[in-house]
Amino acid sequence: LKGQEFAPSHQQVYAPLRADGDKPRAHLTVVRQTPTQHFKNQFPALHWEHELGLAFTKNRMNYTNKFLLIPESGDYFIYSQVTFRGMTSECSEIRQAGRPNKPDSITVVITKVTDSYPEPTQLLMGTKSVCEVGSNWFQPIYLGAMFSLQEGDKLMVNVSDISLVDYTKEDKTFFGAFLL
Amino acid sequence: LKGQEFAPSHQQVYAPLRADGDKPRAHLTVVRQTPTQHFKNQFPALHWEHELGLAFTKNRMNYTNKFLLIPESGDYFIYSQVTFRGMTSECSEIRQAGRPNKPDSITVVITKVTDSYPEPTQLLMGTKSVCEVGSNWFQPIYLGAMFSLQEGDKLMVNVSDISLVDYTKEDKTFFGAFLL
Amino acid sequence: LKGQEFAPSHQQVYAPLRADGDKPRAHLTVVRQTPTQHFKNQFPALHWEHELGLAFTKNRMNYTNKFLLIPESGDYFIYSQVTFRGMTSECSEIRQAGRPNKPDSITVVITKVTDSYPEPTQLLMGTKSVCEVGSNWFQPIYLGAMFSLQEGDKLMVNVSDISLVDYTKEDKTFFGAFLL
């Protein structure tokens, strides 16, 4: 059917043109975490550096109290890496000791809080079983994808265990978003 | 204060408009590495294919001698994946043999070299302990984030051990950047 | 040589201007997979949710029958995460039993099918040996990079073993692309 052909690609401008340098953008980097209270069944949220070193926020994208604040509706690319490190979880020993053979795990969730939805929405999740034979282990979980966000939405990064997060270097654990 | 509402989103153009197809962009793919000398405490840099197969550079983004050259100041999304493969590191045997129980590791760093700063800046790091039980192991480390770069900055990818990098396929190990 | 200096950055507009909100974009999320036949030496392709929950397609980017259809030539950022989970692959036991010591593995490939080329092109591959000591394991593989695509190209995500894909949550396994 003719109707299924692609529309001619020269018919391009249906929305106001926009200078790219004016778009909301942020790259946040890890800081040492202070323990905070959180709901029993909800992973704790990380807080971030937003202006020192590699970190920045610009064009009305602001950071406050663990949240990136979305100043304008649109499609955003959102990403985070969290590097975890810990002492070994000896799964083989756990199994021999008769404990349930569910492995330990590490999880990162990028969560959206919006005023038009009563519960936080999990946008991205990276979860990995950890069953290391060696004594000291470390590994990153990386996430990134595009989402349609509304003005006023708030983004945060939750982790399964804050005490396992490597906060030593700004290039190991980070969180960012930019309007496409 | 009423002023705490978001500024009206129709006030949009504060910078010169820019055709997207004209922005500096590059996607580089792995090639077989030739051993090169590097500073003792610095990870060696990978070199890359920049024009064959899936690889390309465009709009004044150039590749030369392991470096991507940034032709224009702005915010860039930078990414890389390195696939590593090796023979097993038998951590449990290492521990039994009385060697220190520090596991082997694999690391990727995306590094920026800039005229205005004497030391290279580590933008992104992915690092993982490797303590495999099986004999032949392989795994990727992926990194990606947004950074504000200056015209003339140079980007490279460093790895902890060049001999472990899988150079066999252009889709397994790659490096790219594009102006947002 | 003078010609190797960067071109003046104020000479910017060489292509038609384009409203960002009009660009082809898609974010697809996992659904339960129904077994489908596939060629013996080709990994099976996943199918996806394209309109419910977090999933969407817009601006002539369409999804049909496991494929994202590219409606317009240009440079696209393409990404996917697949979370795998399974019962343990006891590599040490496998080795003791005299079976070849090649570990099991999990692989994700983002593939392009194009009219002008008879074979599918592998754009991105993430592949990882799996040799877990614990009983139930799970882990993600993330991929993302930029590619020059042609109008009419088709993108799909192939995996080494569909039965290991975690289809339980839209934030764990996903696939997306957007025109830069």
Epitope: L69, D115, P118, G152 | - | -
Partner: antibody, heavy 116, light 106 residues
């Protein structure tokens, strides 16, 4: 447990400013959004506006925007509503409510009568 | 403003009956929300995002619909369900409620 408590004068003179405070407990209200909704006698519910306590950003009902101001005091876990130039038509039960970071919860409401 | 038209404005049904309330938006919305308000009490969220049951709400309550037409159903009316029910849309500014449906027991 999660609680929202509205407080303020029950009687306001015409042309004056109505002021109410909502004090929250049992959760970090910066993880949420706080709304004000009113219900005039024998009438339905009317959304007045909301604030993001984390940032202070507000959104108002356009029909009230010239008269309404919502603020927050994070040190006290409080959100306040001010409605200026009131008339008898502003007599209502005023509710604060939470949404976004947790299940929707409302306060018990505060009756404000506008009368001379 | 997006106008929400709820019908009926009141209804009377027997215990065990299936009760249906409709809400029509003056323009398409993505999600609908439903609240229950008992006399002298604050509203309570029952259904969010069109069809999701809020925490602690009995499964006899349900919601459905899309675009401009949405439905709220009580599959088997109970004495404690006597209340006024409101629909609400969250997408336009302002957020708007329907005028309410008063449910009584015959």
């Amino acid at each position: 447990q999660v609680q929202l408590q509205e407080s303020g004068p029950g009687l306001v003179r015409p042309s004056q400013t109505l002021s109410l405070t909502c004090t929250v407990s049992g959760f970090d209200y910066q993880d949420t959004y706080m709304h004000w909704v009113r219900q005039r006698p024998g009438r339905g519910l009317e959304w007045m506006g909301r604030i993001d306590p984390a940032s202070g950003h507000t959104k108002y009902n356009p029909s009230l925007k010239s008269r309404v101001t919502i603020t927050r005091d994070t040190s006290k876990n409080q959100v306040s509503l001010r409605l200026s130039s009131v008339t008898a038509a502003d007599t209502a039960v005023y509710y604060c409510a939470v949404s976004g970071g947790m299940p929707d919860v409302w306060g018990q409401g505060s009756l404000v009568t506008v009368s001379s | 403003d997006i106008q929400m038209t709820q019908s009926p404005s009141s209804l009377s049904a027997s215990v065990g009956d299936r009760v249906t309330i409709t809400c029509r938006a003056s323009q398409g919305v993505e999600y609908m929300y439903w609240y229950q308000q008992k006399p002298g009490k604050a509203p309570k969220l029952l259904i969010y995002a069109t069809s999701n049951l809020a925490s602690g709400v009995p499964s006899r309550f349900s919601g459905s619909g899309s675009g401009t037409d949405f439905t709220f159903t009580i599959s088997s009316l109970q004495p404690e369900d006597i209340a006024t029910y409101y629909c609400q849309q969250w997408e336009g500014n302002p957020r708007t409620f329907g005028q309410g449906t008063k449910v009584e027991i015959k």
